[in-house]
């Protein structure tokens, strides 16, 4: 008699079987029904929920020549690469007329070697610095016990006796490998091997040893580097723009830094060819055979002022009786700082030299004492900054003033009543 025509009679003649296997297994669930008339679409349920995107195939075979004859319908659900999410109760479902029919259940179970949800990752750590590694595995079957290994040596006497999901490492002095084994009733699975590379610690106490107008001597304390000696340290310097705002933790300077390498020891470096009276930021990192440490924070430093590198230019000195008019121009050579003024010295053949501070003026009229008969009078001028005097000009002889020469009116500067100090060049 045709099946599926009576409300109480199930059309299913074959129900899904059971599958139990390890992860990755491929299997097929099958159910078969016999119906009269047009074959229905077979749906698959897992734990009572219709599988919308099931990998199923449906085969229909007529048992007679007439469409109203019986049909055999076979539906196969393919499970590829069995995962924990595939486990559960499977059933077939059909709608016939106004009725819904569900097959007897079949069961898909997972049971095999432990499966890793999380494995230790490669990383770099500073020498003697604590860090954590993670490992997580599951069955079924449960329980799953973990055993950590360092350089292939177990860190506990038996699985489950040592650290489990998280391994705390107080610090390493050499590059090491870590893995974990997951044990359950079915056997053992080994995780990937993570390589932990030991880099030097960040240098400490970056500071100045000396600061000169065009060079800085810098020193630092190296961090620990484990069993790997430091090969060199790298220092970066960058000009500090007023608006630059390199903060303690800011990762990169706004322009390409000047980079210098220092062989170590000593843990010092001289940075030369710098601009005087200029702010810089510096940082340092040290390298071993395993790689570089992290950079120190940017340290603000500043080169101090220097003395002018050359004497004033175009000095002219003319004399008219008891007055001498001297003028000059700013040095062409770098001032290496803020020009504070000029010093002028004059001396006759048999008279002590006289030193005067002229300030920022570039000309002066001297009121010479006596009748102006002092012979062979010469004048020297030097520029100065806060750092001191620059080089003195060569002595310039006073030329006699000739009528027709311009002789501007200037404030007279009286000669000091007592001579100042002597210079070795006289």
């Amino acid at each position: 008699a045709p099946r599926g025509t009576q409300a109480e009679e199930s059309p299913f003649v074959g129900n899904p079987g059971n599958i139990t296997g390890a992860r990755g297994l491929t299997g097929t669930l099958r159910c078969q029904l016999q119906v009269q008339g047009e074959p229905p679409e077979v749906h698959w349920l897992r734990d009572g929920q219709i599988l919308e995107l099931a990998d199923s195939t449906q085969t229909q075979v007529p048992l007679g020549e007439d469409e109203q004859d019986d049909w055999i319908v076979v539906s196969q659900l393919r499970i590829t690469s069995l995962q924990l999410s595939d486990t559960g109760q499977y059933q077939c479902l059909v709608f016939l007329g106004h009725q819904t029919f569900v097959s007897q259940p079949g069961y898909v179970g997972l049971e095999g070697l432990p499966y890793f949800l999380e494995e230790p990752e490669d990383r770099t750590v500073a020498a003697n610095t604590p860090f954590n590694l993670s490992c997580q595995a599951q069955g079924p079957p449960e329980p799953v016990d973990l055993l950590w290994l360092q350089d292939a040596v177990p860190l506990a006497t038996a699985p489950g006796h040592g650290p489990q999901r998280s391994l705390h490492v107080p610090g390493l002095n050499k590059t090491s490998s870590f893995s974990c084994e997951a044990h359950n009733a079915k056997g053992v699975t080994t995780s990937r091997t993570a390589t932990i590379t030991v880099l030097p610690q960040q240098p400490r106490n970056l500071h100045l040893v000396s600061r000169q107008p065009t060079e800085l001597e810098v020193a630092w304390t190296p961090g620990l580097s484990g069993i790997y000696p430091l090969t060199h340290c790298t220092l970066q310097a960058v000009l500090s723009d007023d608006g630059m705002g390199i903060q303690a933790g800011e990762p990169d300077p706004p322009e390409e830094p000047l980079t210098s390498q220092a062989s170590v020891p000593p843990h010092q470096l001289r940075l030369g060819s710098l601009h005087p009276h200029t702010p810089y930021h510096i940082r340092v990192a040290c390298t071993s055979s395993q790689g570089p440490s992290s950079w120190t924070h940017w340290l603000p430093v500043e080169t101090p002022e220097g003395v002018p590198l050359g004497p004033p230019e175009n000095i002219s000195a003319t004399r008219n009786g008891s007055q001498a008019f001297v003028h000059w121009q700013e040095p062409r050579a770098p001032l290496q700082g803020t020009l504070l003024g000029y010093r002028l010295a004059y001396q006759g053949q048999d008279t002590p030299e006289v030193l005067m501070d002229i300030g920022l003026r570039q000309e002066v009229t001297l009121e010479l004492q006596g009748d102006g008969s002092v012979s062979n009078l010469t004048v020297c001028v030097a520029a100065y900054t806060a750092a001191g005097d620059g080089p003195w000009s060569l002595p310039v002889p006073l030329e006699a003033w000739r009528p027709g020469q311009a002789q501007p009116v200037h404030q007279l500067v009286k000669e000091p009543s007592t001579p100042a100090f002597s210079w070795p060049w006289w």
């Epitope: 000396s210 600061r211 020193a219 010092q268 001289r270 220097g306 806060a386 750092a387």
Partner: antibody, heavy 117, light 107 residues
Framework: CQSVEESGGRLVTPGTPLTLTCTVS????????MIWVRQAPGEGLEWIGT?????ATAYARWAKGRFTISKTSTTVDLKMTSLTTEDTATYFC?????????????WGPGTLVTVSL | DIVMTQTPASVEAAVGDTVTIKCQAS??????LAWYQQKPGQPPKLLIY???NLPSGVPSRFKGSGSGTEYTLTISGVQCDDAATYYC?????????FGGGTEVVVK
């Protein structure tokens, strides 16, 4: 182990030239600056001059022309001419603190130069 | 030349006292200052560099401070072993100048 030792100090008469030698051990003179300093009996320290890693020299103003510093791979010499009684002192040689040209952290015990008639 | 004026020329202290030695430069030397300790018959020993930094091996009771033209060496909790003469050294603009020295006598 690094060490510095001066030698050549002795009793001389005024006008006699004299060369002092600073012998270094375990010190790469292409890495470290070296300094000569003197100390008259009961007096303070007085810088004479420095020789830098590249062989360049710097002198105190009073020492220019009369004192000359030179070096080989293991020695630093101080040549002194026209010695006077004022030059009687213990002469020290010292190595730079790390690469510093200005700060000195390893000193020799000194050698005594006496200039007397 | 830069002149370094060191004061006092001599100071007496009891064990445990704090001693302060001052060094004044005739112009700004931008912290380019070192301090040395010298005991009779011995060479100087570096105590402080760049005004305030201690080389390794120097006890922390020695402290350097100052900037510009005024610098100070402070010895806290003076010990018998600290009896010596102390010198400041300026090294600004490639010029090395020592102060006149301060003798520390420990009672």
């Amino acid at each position: 182990c690094q060490s510095v030792e001066e030698s050549g100090g002795r009793l001389v008469t005024p006008g006699t030239p004299l060369t002092l030698t600073c012998t270094v051990s375990g010190i790469d003179l292409s890495t470290y600056a070296m300094i000569w300093v003197r100390q008259a009996p009961g007096e303070g320290l007085e810088w004479i001059g420095t020789i830098y890693t590249d062989g360049a020299t710097a002198y105190a103003r009073w020492a220019k022309g009369r004192f000359t510093i030179s070096k080989t791979s293991t020695t630093v010499d101080l040549k002194m001419t026209s010695l006077t009684t004022e030059d009687t002192a213990t002469y020290f040689c010292a190595r730079g603190f790390g690469i510093s040209k200005f700060v000195f952290s390893l000193w020799g015990p000194g050698t005594l130069v006496t200039v007397s008639l | 030349d830069i002149v370094m004026t060191q004061t006092p020329a001599s100071v007496e202290a009891a064990v445990g006292d704090t001693v302060t030695i001052k060094c004044q430069a005739s112009q700004n030397i931008y912290s380019n200052l070192a301090w040395y300790q010298q005991k009779p018959g011995q060479p100087p020993k570096l105590l402080i560099y760049f005004a305030s930094n201690l080389p390794s091996g120097v006890p922390s009771r020695f402290k350097g401070s100052g900037s510009g033209t005024e610098y100070t060496l402070t010895i806290s909790g003076v010990q018998c072993d600290d009896a010596a003469t102390y010198y400041c050294q300026n090294y600004y603009i490639n010029e090395i100048v020592f102060g006149g020295g301060t003798e520390v006598v420990v009672k």
